[in-house]
Structures are given as C-alpha cells and as structure tokens.
C-alpha cells in the first residue's frame, strides 16, 4: 500500500505502466492495477475472460474490505449475502433469503416469521388488548328511560396489533340485552309524537303483548291491550337478566 512497496513492484514487473489510472500505485497494461494507493481496496473485476485489478475507496455490493499489512482487499460476502461486515455478519441478504442473527436463511426458524419488507426474521407478535371499559348505559333507540328492553355495550382497545403469524385479536366490542331503568322520561327525552309512532311488530318469540313504550307509561290510564300485570313484569325482568346475550366484533 505504501510507496516503497509500489517502487519495488514496479522494478519487478516487466509490463508495468508509468501512468496508472486513479487509485493504482502500480499497474500493468494487461492486468490493470497491481497495487493500490493507501487506504484504497484492491478488487478483481471480471471483464469477459479477463480479470482486471481495480482500486476502490469502498468495496462493491457483495464484498467487504479487509486491511492487511501488505494489502487492503475486497473479500466476497457469502453467496446468499448482498451486504456484509465480514463473513460472519451479513447485513442484507440476497433476494429470497431472510436475515437472522447475521446469517441468510431461506426459511425463518421456529418461533419467528419472515418480514417481507425488511427481509428479516422477526419475533411473532401476538395481539394484546386492554381490560374492558365499563358497560355503557342501557338504552333503547338512544333513550335511557322508560320500562323497556334495551342494549348495553362495552369496548376494549387493541394495545398491540398482531404480526402475520400472531394470534388474532379477540372481540373488542360486546353487546348484551338489558332492561332500561324504570323511570319516567322527561319532556326532552320523549320519542316521536303519538300520531307518528307506529306499533312495532313483535319480535319472534316475544309476547304479542308488546312492552309499553314511554308514552303509554306516562299516561295514568292503561290501555287494556298493552297492559301487563305486575307479576309478568317481574318475571320478564328476571328472564332478561338471565338472557344476557353477547354480540361480538372480531378484529
């Protein structure tokens, strides 16, 4: 790499050129660079059937530079490696290989998965969710008053989204049936005016005697068709509590 080495080589080599191209300390017309100026790396470049010596400030892709006392040279990375620090540590693999612990693998080891963006083997990440938030108030058509069956909902957040091979997230929403609290609706809470209100068809399996809506509960007179005796009301309340059906949303 130093001048004295260059001069010594120049005397020995019959074909040495005086005017070497950039970076060469000594060179020949046929072989190109034979030695390099300080700090430059010597590499062999194949041109057809011939190998030409070149001097580079850094080694090309697929090679890494090593400094020895007598030569700084470009050394080939392993066959499956595109960029490396040395033979032991690849930093970027060739297409179709995944980087793991400095090595290039065609498949990731057990417990790891391939990240096709970074082309690395990464730890499998499972979904993580928070604790459930409290149940929302029991509502029916957005109202929390009146003596009706409604629904209540609770939610939880996704703290960690899963990776491709990770466990899917459990439901983050849960809905169940409930009984709207038994109190008279205030004026602002009232539904549509009587003439706009339509009688709802009873749900499958529900008594033809529909649950009275808030308007009829307000009235001191009870219309016979809509009336339920106190015992039936109590009985229904118990059934509703037991029949707390969960409807879930999976992410």
């Amino acid at each position: 790499q130093n001048a004295s080495r260059g001069r010594r080589q120049r005397r020995m080599h019959p074909n040495v050129s005086q005017g070497c191209q950039g970076g060469c300390a000594t060179c020949s017309d046929y072989n190109g660079c034979l030695s390099c100026k300080p700090r430059l790396f010597f590499a062999l470049e194949r041109i057809g059937m011939k190998q030409i010596g070149v001097c580079l400030s850094s080694c090309p892709s697929g090679y890494y530079g090593t400094r020895y006392p007598d030569i700084n040279k470009c050394t080939k990375c392993k066959a499956d490696c595109d960029t490396c620090f040395n033979k032991n540590f690849c930093t970027k693999c060739k297409s179709g290989f995944y980087l793991h612990l400095g090595k290039c693998l065609d498949n990731c080891p057990e417990g790891l998965e391939a990240n096709n963006h970074t082309m690395e083997c990464v730890s499998i990440v499972h979904c993580e969710v928070s604790e459930w938030n409290p149940w929302s108030p029991c509502t029916k058509k957005g109202k929390t008053c009146g003596f009706k069956r409604g629904t209540e909902t609770r939610v939880r957040e996704i703290i960690q989204h899963p990776s491709a091979k990770g466990n899917l997230c459990p439901p983050t929403n849960e809905t169940r049936k409930c009984t709207v609290q038994r109190k008279k609706c205030q004026k602002g809470e009232r539904g549509k005016k009587g003439r706009e209100r339509k009688r709802k068809k009873p749900n499958k399996g529900e008594s033809k005697e529909a649950i009275p809506d808030s308007k009829s509960l307000e009235s001191s007179k009870e219309i016979p068709e809509q009336r339920e005796n106190k015992q039936q009301q109590k009985k229904r309340k118990v059934q509703d509590k037991q029949k707390s059906v969960s409807v879930s949303t999976v992410h």
Partner: antibody
C-alpha cells in the same frame, strides 16, 4: 454452533518451546482467517498472529516475530501456534479466534506460564 | 502501532445507572472500531462493530458512537449482568490493537 477448543498450554522454562492447538467445529474452517490473541494475568488483550484462510500469508506482532509460527491444517480443522524461545513476558492465557476485522468467535483459552 | 487509550480504567456504578466508557485512538481510525465485553475467567465477547452496529442478541441498552479518534460505549441502564471489563479494538491498521480495558464494578 461455532466451537474453538485450545490445548497445549502449561508451565515451561524460559528459552523452551510449546505448541498450542485449536480444534475448530461448527463452521467452514477453511473459509476463515484465524488468529491467536493473548492476555497476561490481570492485563489487557494483545493480538499475537493471524493466518489467512488458505494458509498462504501470516502476520505477527513485532515482539514474537521469528520466535512464534502460526499454521493451520484445513483438512483437520485445526490451528496451531508453535512458540520457541519463550520468555517470562509470554506468560498469558492464549485464545484462538476467528479474525475477520473483528475477533468474532473465541475459544476458552489455554494458560501458558513461562517460569524458571 | 496505533495506541488505544480507554478511560476510566475502572468505574463503580449501580444497577439502573447510565454509564459511558471512552476510547481514544492515537491516529484516525475512521469507523473501524469494535467493543468487547469480558467476564472473569471467560473469553471476550464481541458487542459492537463499526462504531455503532450491535451484534445480534446484544441488548439495545448498549450503544456506540464517535468517529476518527474519539469513541464512546454507553450503557443506558446498567443491569446486574453488565458488570464486566470492556475493551475497544481498532481494525483500521495492523497490528490490530486493543484498549487496556475498563473494569465496571458494582458500587
């Protein structure tokens, strides 16, 4: 798994010789430059010698040149250090290691004590 | 030969502390610097190469910085297993040389 196991250490008188061996397994030995690094008791690390992958070139620290010879047998996956004319200051734990800019894999070391 | 000077030569610290070890080269070694950890009776273990590239499996609390002649190894929050001796090494020039070591002890 890469394994390097040194042997051949011991107590020797000044001026005498000793040959250390390092048996390699778990990697393609013939692809790697190999080195010996030593550590005197309670002291730092000191590179001793390196041999390139095919054995064609060797390098030594000045204080051991002409006395120590590094060699390898790629067919046996073994690295050697022939130490002649030993001195008290050669007393150390001798480690063999892969040498590729850094010393990536190390053996457990073998103790060499030069004492009269 | 390039001289590598580490400071301090020993250091007492507690678990959870942030610790910095420095390494100075007698001439420009660009980014050709590595750090090793050695525990008593064991061989050294490579932690960092090219100043700041962590070897796979080395915890991210270890980091390296610097260029030219001045370099540092930082452990952001000391763990019990980090108490050991640390060495820097230059590989820019033969002979490859090491710092004299920094012994990290429990306070």
């Amino acid at each position: 798994e890469v394994q390097l196991v040194e042997s051949g250490g011991g107590v020797v008188q000044p001026g005498r010789s000793l040959r250390l061996s390092c048996a390699a397994s778990g990697f393609t030995f013939s692809d790697y430059d190999m080195a010996w690094v030593r550590q005197a008791p309670g002291k730092g690390l000191e590179w001793v010698a390196t041999i390139i992958y095919d054995g064609s070139r060797t390098y030594y620290r000045d204080s051991v040149k002409g006395r120590f010879t590094i060699s390898r047998d790629n067919s046996k996956n073994t690295l050697y250090l022939q130490m002649n004319s030993l001195r008290a200051e050669d007393t150390a734990v001798y480690y063999c290691a892969t040498h590729d800019k850094t010393f990536d894999y190390w053996g457990q070391g073998t103790m060499v004590t030069v004492s009269s | 030969d390039i001289q590598m000077t580490q400071s301090p030569s020993s250091l007492s610290a507690s678990v959870g502390d942030r610790v910095t070890i420095t390494c100075r080269a007698s001439e420009d070694i660009y980014s050709d610097l590595a750090w090793y950890q050695q525990k008593p009776g064991k061989a050294p273990k490579l932690l960092i190469y090219d100043v700041n590239s962590l070897i796979h499996g080395v915890p991210s609390r270890f980091s390296g910085s610097g260029s030219g002649t001045d370099f540092t190894l930082t452990i952001s929050s000391l763990q019990p297993e980090d108490f050991a001796t640390y060495f820097c090494q230059q590989y820019d020039n033969y002979p490859n040389t090491f710092g004299q070591g920094t012994k990290l002890e429990i306070k």
